[in-house]
């Protein structure tokens, strides 16, 4: 058994039929020593008396939030939460797995830049009695720090018969140097708890490994006389570091119809312009990636041929 | 420690292709690794990350674009002497910063071709021959020192008695390619910044 | 199986035309772009132009430009390449090639070898 | 137009080691560049699309690199059907130009 936060209790169970269970020693936070009783949640059953109870937590009908009492007065509470280790592996039943880049990938994260600042997220099909907690740093021996703020619920999805809700958090590492080389990780540790459930999980990763920039703005056609050939140009996004030879970016630009399987024109770029064919019905677009250092594509920016 | 402004005139900053070159080579040559060796600890996650310049050159701190050395976090106090003079410097408005940072990744260059060439004798007396360093990446090493051109003393290779433990050798070189890739990114922000400058 | 099959080899006369066809089978004709690619002997690839044969788009070469013309006839499924004031150097096999992409080639026909001789 | 030098245009190679065959552009091209095999009387077949993307049915022998203005074509080891002509096409504007070609034969 550990503490999570302030009478807050995790107790950590090996769960099989017939398990054991932990037994858990719980102390009334009071100078009183005569007098006490226990009580679980809401119910007014009296589960023993003294300063100190002893209860074998098994499932999770023995866990919840224990108070102490004395002559109708609360002293004090205790929340029991159970981790659940089925097979000598932790439960991830809150999550669910994004299975990218790869299977058991719970948490994703990405940055819009070098700055330090990045965002990860989360799903789960759960809607109720749900919270979260994050923390992070770089490194996990030494910790250097990395601020989070609260994860919040950013977007909901229908996905066949059942609802998806996204959560998210920004992060923001405390001294970064856009320039750096890292060494050392970031770590990002979620805590989740729906109703007595706990469980956590873990991210490790660079922030050069999750680079994905804005796509590019700006995006202008001009026609070539006597061509059909278009020249497009665009910008780098407002929130890519600086300065821009240093922190280059590369681009593919592309013509396409509405459908991917059709024909299309297709060229990449280190240059913030491109000519290429436009076709009636189709779109240009462009996206950017780092130049020296592929990470991920950022999404298209789009403008019609017409 | 930072970059000037005034650098070389666009286009005649002879670094820019070999770095481009040399940032190539060492990808190709970690892809190759990491398949090659597909049973050994050769991924990015999976390494210890090591930087063998570590106190021995500066060279993110003393190439720090102008525009970051009012970033706090980016000024190292670390302190590293150089020796000032060099081909890449095409231009008399060249300051002594520049050469600095250009001296810094020719210490580089050279702590990597040695640390590679000793690897090198090693792997090429493993009897499963299961790989071996690109002569290619070897080759735009050498051609990017020579076109920096800083003289500095040899730096002897390291030879060793004892008999060389492949598996230990294999995933030493997994962790020198991927730190040599990454300081290979910083050279080449370096040189495309000096080039538009 | 997509296939491009060309027709066969041609003799012109210098000063004349010539007009070769490549029929395509398997995929739907429209959604390719078209191109035609030359080989003099013991020379490499020349570019010669392209069309898009669902609206009739086409791009030549500069070297080509005025002297050939590309076309498609979607109810055949068959391109056509015309070379016009055909000269000795103009010798070569002529291919045409396909890709959904507009820049390179997946898919070869066999080649037709057109000879320019007096 | 952009110029594509090929070398070496002639490389005899022992059946089993390695080839390696470079292709320059005269201007930098990004990663539009294109391999194609070419055998005797045969029509062209791609080998790899823009630098290093392998194409389907191609054997994973063949490896592209490069961008900017060098770029590489390596056959880890040389099969006896891969002797043949290997041209380069750039794809980064019209018109689009091919290499010399280099010639792959046995040693």
């Known amino acids: 058994i550990w503490e999570l936060k302030k009478d807050v209790y995790v107790v950590e169970l090996d769960w099989y039929p017939d398990a054991p269970g932990e037994m858990v020693v719980l102390t009334c936070d009071t100078p009183e020593e005569d007098g006490i009783t226990w009580t679980l949640d809401q119910s007014s059953e009296v589960l023993g008396s003294g300063k100190t109870l002893t209860i074998q937590v098994k499932e999770f009908g023995d866990a919840g939030q224990y108070t102490c009492h004395k002559g109708g007065e609360v002293l004090s509470h205790s929340l029991l939460l159970l981790h659940k280790k089925e097979d000598g592996i932790w439960s991830t039943d809150i999550l669910k797995d994004q299975k990218e880049p790869k299977n058991k990938t719970f948490l994703r994260c990405e940055a819009k830049n070098y700055s330090g600042r990045f965002t990860c997220w989360w799903l789960t099909t759960i809607s109720t009695d749900l919270t979260f907690s994050v923390k992070s740093s770089r490194g996990s021996s030494d910790p250097q720090g990395v601020t989070c703020g609260a994860a919040t619920l950013s977007a909901e999805r229908v996905r066949g018969d059942n609802k998806e809700y996204e959560y998210s958090v920004e992060c923001q590492e405390d001294s970064a140097c856009p320039a750096a080389e890292e060494s050392l990780p970031i770590e990002v540790m979620v805590d989740a708890v729906h109703k007595l459930k706990y469980e956590n999980y873990t991210s490790s990763f660079f922030i050069r490994d999750i680079i994905k920039p804005d796509p590019p703005k700006n995006l202008q056609l001009k026609p070539l006389k006597n061509s059909r050939q278009v020249e497009v140009s665009w910008e780098y996004p407002d929130t890519w570091s600086t300065p821009h030879s240093y922190f280059s970016l590369t681009f593919c630009v592309q013509v396409q119809g509405k459908s991917k399987r059709e024909k299309k024109d297709r060229v990449f770029t280190d240059k913030t312009s491109a000519t290429v064919i436009c076709r009636k019905n189709a779109s240009i677009s462009v996206r950017a990636q780092d130049r020296y250092y592929s990470s991920s594509w950022s999404e298209w920016a789009s403008v019609p041929c017409s | 420690r930072n970059l000037p402004v005034a650098t070389p005139d666009p286009g005649m900053f002879p670094c820019l292709h070999h770095s481009q070159n040399l940032l190539r080579a060492v990808s190709n040559m970690l892809q190759k690794a990491r398949q090659t060796l597909e049973f050994y600890p050769c991924t990015s996650e999976e390494i210890d990350h090591e930087d063998i310049t570590k106190d021995k050159t500066s060279t993110v701190e003393a190439c720090l674009p102008l525009e970051l050395t009012k970033n706090e976090s980016c000024l190292n106090s670390r302190e590293t002497s150089f020796i000032t003079n060099g081909s890449c410097l095409a231009s008399r408005k060249t300051s002594f910063m520049m050469a600095l940072c250009l001296s810094s990744i020719y210490e580089d260059l050279k702590m990597y071709q040695v640390e590679f060439k000793t690897m090198n004798a090693k792997l090429l007396m493993d009897p499963k021959r299961q790989i071996f360093l690109d002569q290619n990446m070897l080759a735009v090493i050498d051609e990017l020192m020579q076109a920096l051109n800083f003289n500095s003393e040899t730096v002897p290779q390291k030879s060793s008695l004892e008999e060389p433990d492949f598996y230990k050798t294999k995933i030493k070189l997994c962790i020198l390619l991927h730190a040599f890739r990454i300081r290979a990114v910083t050279i080449d922000r370096v040189m495309s910044y000096l080039n538009a400058s | 199986q997509v296939q491009l099959v060309q027709s066969g080899a041609e003799v012109k006369k210098p000063g004349s035309s010539v007009k070769v066809s490549c029929k395509a089978s398997g995929g739907t004709f429209s959604d390719y772009y078209l191109h035609w690619v030359r080989q003099a002997p013991g020379q490499g690839q020349e570019w010669m132009g392209w069309?898009?044969?669902?609206?009739?788009?086409?791009e030549y070469a500069p070297k080509f430009q005025g002297r050939v013309t590309i076309t498609a006839d979607e109810s055949t499924s068959t391109a056509y390449m015309e070379l016009s004031s055909l000269r000795s150097e103009d010798t070569a096999v002529y291919y045409c090639a396909r890709n959904k992409e507009l820049r390179y080639f997946d898919v070869w026909g066999q080649g037709t070898l057109v000879t320019v001789s007096s | 137009d952009i110029v594509m030098t090929q070398s070496p245009l002639s490389l005899p190679v022992t059946p089993g080691e390695p080839a390696s065959i470079s292709c320059r552009a005269s201007q930098s091209i990004s990663i539009n560049l294109h391999w194609y095999q070419q055998k005797p009387g045969q029509a062209p077949r791609q080998l790899i699309a823009f630098a290093s993307q392998s194409i389907s049915g191609v054997p994973s022998r063949f490896s592209g690199s490069g961008s900017g203005t060098d770029f590489t074509l390596t056959i880890s080891s040389l099969q006896p059907e891969d002797f043949a002509t290997y041209y380069c096409?750039?794809?980064?504007?019209?018109?689009?130009?091919f290499g010399q070609g280099t010639k792959v034969e046995i040693k």
């Open positions: 096409q750039q794809s980064n504007s019209f018109p689009l130009t």
């Open positions: 069309i898009d044969p669902e609206n009739g788009d086409t």
